[in-house]
C-alpha cells in the first residue's frame, strides 16, 4: 500500500503567441481546482474509462478576478497535495491524466457552475520511495508545471512497496535470514505475508497466509465490523466478543453515493462508481454540461443544458466514443494492396509490405527478376514478389541450372524406350506399336490406329511426332 | 486539400430506398480506396460498404443484399444504393477515403456527414 503524491506547481499561459483569455472576470470571479486520474501500465486508454489506480479532487483554490487589461498570469492554485492512495502494489509504470477546473462564482441560479480548463495526460516509468519527477504539459494554450511521487506506507517498502517492514525485536541486528530494512535501518525486513485481502487497519497474522482480526471486527478478511448487542440469532461466539455477533453497519447501507451512483464495498471502507458527469469520493462534484465543453476533436455537444440532463457529443469524422476521444478504424476501409498489412497510427495510416512489394500502400510490385539471370536460355517471369524461371527444353530448377531428364517420367508406352535428345525425348516403340509415344498401336493388316490427319496431312505422308 | 461532399440523406419508411453520392475534389491524383461508414448515436463508427486498396468491394454483414456501392472513376465519385431500408439502418452516414495527392502522398479524408432516418 502507498500514495501517489501530486504538487501542481503553476498553471498558466503557455509560451509563445496566442496567448489563452483569462478563465475569470470582474464580472465573474473564480478559482480553480484539479482532479487526477490514474491508471496501470502503459496502455493509451480513453479519458471515460476507470481510474484503476485511482483518483482524487484537489481543494479549491483562491478567488481570483482578472485585472482588466493585464495579461493572464499563473492562476493562483489550491493549497497541499493531491493524494491517491492505493491499496495494492504500485505498478511502477501508470498513466495519467491531470484535468484543471475552473469554478465561477458568480450569481448563477442553482450554485457554482463548473467548466473543464484542460486537460493533459501522459504515461510514465516511477519507482515507488524515489525523489520527486517534475514535468511540464501542455493543453493548447495553458501550461501545467507540476511535480509527483509514489510513495509506500508503513510497513511496506520497495519500489513496488510490497515488502513489509517491523520494528525490530533485538537491538542489534534482525532475526535470521531477515534484513535490515533500507532505508529504515532500524527496521527488519518482515517474512510474514497475511492472507491476501486481509485488511490492513482490522486485521493481522502471526502466521504466513492468516487473517486474524482485531476487536470489533470479524470475517475472512476482517472487514465485517460486529457489534455486540444482545440479539435474537445468535452467529456464534467470538474470542474477541462474548455473546452473539451481529453484523455491524455495512458502508454501503444507506448510499453514500450521491447523484446515482452505484457503492461497492472494497477491503477499507466503500467505492462509489459514479455516472457520467459526477466526480469525487461520494459523485458529489456536480455534472458536465456541454457549457463545460466535454467533447473532444471539435464534437459537438448538444443536450445537457443543467447537470440533470445527459449531454451527447456529436463526433466529427473520424471520431467516436461518449466524448469524441477514440479514432475510428479507418484500416476497415483495407487501404493497403498486395496483402499489405494495416496500421492506424492516429496521426497517419501505414501499410506493412509482403516481402516483394513497397510503397506507402505497398503498391509498387519490386523489380524480382532485377539481377536475376535465368540460365541455359531461360527467361524470368514476375509475380506475387517472387520470382520464377520459365527455362527452355531440357533444363529445371529455380535457375534453370539443372539439366532435366526428360525420360524420368517415363513417356513412352507400351514398353518403348526413351532417349534424351537436345530437343526433348526420343521414343524407340517395341514391335507392333508406333507413335512419338509409342501410343498407337499398329493393326495385324499393316494399317494402324493413328489420329485422323490434320488439315494439309494426306495420309501415308511421313508424320514428325517430337 | 481535398473535399467529400456527400448527398442524397434523409428520412424514409422501412422497406424503402435511397441514394447516396459522395463527391471527391480538389489535390487527387488517385484514390486508392473509397467507402461509406456510419454511427448510430451511443454506438461506434462501421464501415458500411467501401472499394478497398486492391479494388474490390466490402460490406457489413448486416447490409450485404441490400445496399450495393458502385462508382464513377472520372467524376471521383461513389454511391451508395439502399434498398429494403430497416430502422437499424437510422444513423449519420460518413463518406471516407484514402486518396493519393499531387504529392504523391496518401491521407485519409472523412466528409461532413448525412443523416438518413428510417421510421414508420
Known amino acids: 500500500a502507498g500514495v501517489f503524491e501530486l504538487q501542481i506547481h503553476s498553471f498558466g499561459p503557455g509560451p509563445g503567441p496566442g496567448a489563452p483569455r483569462s478563465p475569470c472576470s470582474a464580472r465573474l470571479p473564480c478559482r480553480l481546482f484539479f482532479r487526477v486520474c490514474l491508471k496501470p501500465g502503459l496502455s493509451e486508454e480513453a479519458a471515460e474509462s476507470p481510474c484503476a489506480l485511482g483518483a482524487a479532487l484537489s481543494a479549491r483554490g483562491p478567488v481570483y478576478t482578472e485585472q482588466p487589461g493585464a495579461p493572464a498570469p499563473d492562476l493562483p492554485l489550491p493549497d497541499g497535495l493531491l493524494q491517491v492512495p492505493f491499496r495494492d502494489a504500485w505498478p511502477g509504470t501508470f498513466s495519467f491524466i491531470i484535468e484543471t477546473w475552473r469554478e465561477e462564482l458568480g450569481d448563477q441560479i442553482g450554485g457554482p457552475a463548473w467548466s473543464l480548463l484542460a486537460r493533459v495526460a501522459g504515461r510514465r516509468r516511477l519507482a515507488a520511495g524515489g525523489p520527486w519527477a517534475r514535468d511540464i504539459q501542455r493543453a493548447g494554450a495553458w501550461e501545467l508545471r507540476f511535480s509527483y511521487r509514489a510513495r509506500c506506507e508503513p510497513p511496506a517498502v520497495g519500489t513496488a512497496c510490497t515488502r513489509l517492514c517491523r520494528p525490530r525485536s533485538a537491538p542489534s541486528r534482525c532475526g535470521p535470514g531477515l534484513r535490515p530494512c533500507a532505508p529504515l535501518e532500524d527496521e527488519c525486513e518482515a517474512p510474514l505475508v497475511c492472507r491476501a485481502g486481509c485488511s490492513p487497519e482490522h486485521g493481522f497474522c502471526e502466521q504466513p497466509g492468516e487473517c486474524r482480526c482485531l476487536e470489533g471486527w470479524t470475517g475472512p478478511l476482517c472487514t465485517v465490523p460486529v457489534s455486540t448487542s444482545s440479539c435474537l440469532s445468535p452467529r456464534g461466539p467470538s474470542s474477541a466478543t462474548t455473546g452473539c455477533l451481529v453484523p455491524g453497519p455495512g458502508p454501503c447501507d444507506g448510499n453514500p453515493c450521491a447523484n446515482g451512483g452505484s457503492c461497492s464495498e472494497t477491503p477499507r471502507s466503500f467505492e462509489c462508481t459514479c455516472p457520467r458527469g459526477f466526480y469525487g469520493l461520494r459523485c458529489e462534484v456536480s455534472g458536465v454540461t456541454c457549457a463545460d465543453g466535454p467533447c473532444f476533436n471539435g464534437g459537438l455537444c448538444v443536450g445537457g443544458a443543467d447537470p440533470d440532463s445527459a449531454y451527447i457529443c456529436h463526433c466529427p469524422p473520424g471520431f467516436q466514443g461518449s466524448n469524441c476521444e477514440k479514432r475510428v478504424d479507418r484500416c476497415s476501409l483495407q487501404p493497403c494492396r498486395n496483402g499489405g498489412l494495416c496500421l492506424d497510427l492516429g496521426h497517419a495510416l501505414r501499410c506493412r509490405c509482403r516481402a516483394g512489394f513497397a510503397g506507402p500502400r505497398c503498391e509498387h510490385d519490386l523489380d524480382d527478376c532485377a539481377g536475376r539471370a535465368c540460365a541455359n536460355g531461360g527467361t524470368c517471369v514476375e509475380g506475387g514478389g517472387a520470382h520464377r524461371c520459365s527455362c527452355a527444353l531440357g533444363f529445371g530448377g529455380r535457375d534453370c541450372r539443372e539439366r532435366a531428364d526428360p525420360c524420368a517420367a517415363r513417356p513412352c508406352a507400351h514398353g518403348g524406350r526413351c532417349y534424351a535428345h537436345f530437343s526433348g525425348l526420343v521414343c524407340a516403340c517395341a514391335p507392333g506399336y508406333m507413335g512419338a509415344r509409342c501410343e498407337f498401336p499398329v493393326h495385324p493388316d499393316g494399317a494402324s490406329a493413328l489420329p485422323a490427319a490434320p488439315p494439309g496431312l494426306r495420309p501415308g505422308d511421313p508424320q514428325r511426332y517430337l | 486539400e481535398v473535399q467529400l461532399v456527400e448527398s442524397g440523406g434523409g428520412e424514409v419508411q422501412p422497406g424503402g430506398s435511397l441514394r447516396l453520392s459522395c463527391a471527391a475534389s480538389?489535390?487527387?491524383?488517385?484514390?486508392?480506396?473509397m467507402g461509406w461508414y456510419r454511427q448510430a448515436p451511443g454506438k461506434q463508427r462501421e464501415l458500411v460498404a467501401g472499394?478497398?486498396?486492391?479494388?474490390?468491394?466490402k460490406y457489413a454483414e448486416s447490409v450485404k443484399g441490400r445496399f450495393t456501392i458502385s462508382r464513377d472513376n472520372a467524376k471521383n465519385t461513389v454511391y451508395l444504393q439502399m434498398s429494403s431500408l430497416r430502422a437499424e439502418d437510422t444513423a449519420v452516414y460518413y463518406c471516407?477515403?484514402?486518396?493519393?495527392?499531387?504529392?504523391?502522398?496518401?491521407?485519409?479524408?472523412w466528409g461532413q456527414g448525412t443523416l438518413v432516418t428510417v421510421k414508420p
Open positions: 480538389g489535390s487527387i491524383f488517385s484514390i486508392n480506396a
Open positions: 471516407a477515403a484514402d486518396v493519393q495527392l499531387l504529392n504523391s502522398d496518401y491521407e485519409f479524408y
Open positions: 472499394f478497398t486498396g486492391e479494388g474490390s468491394t
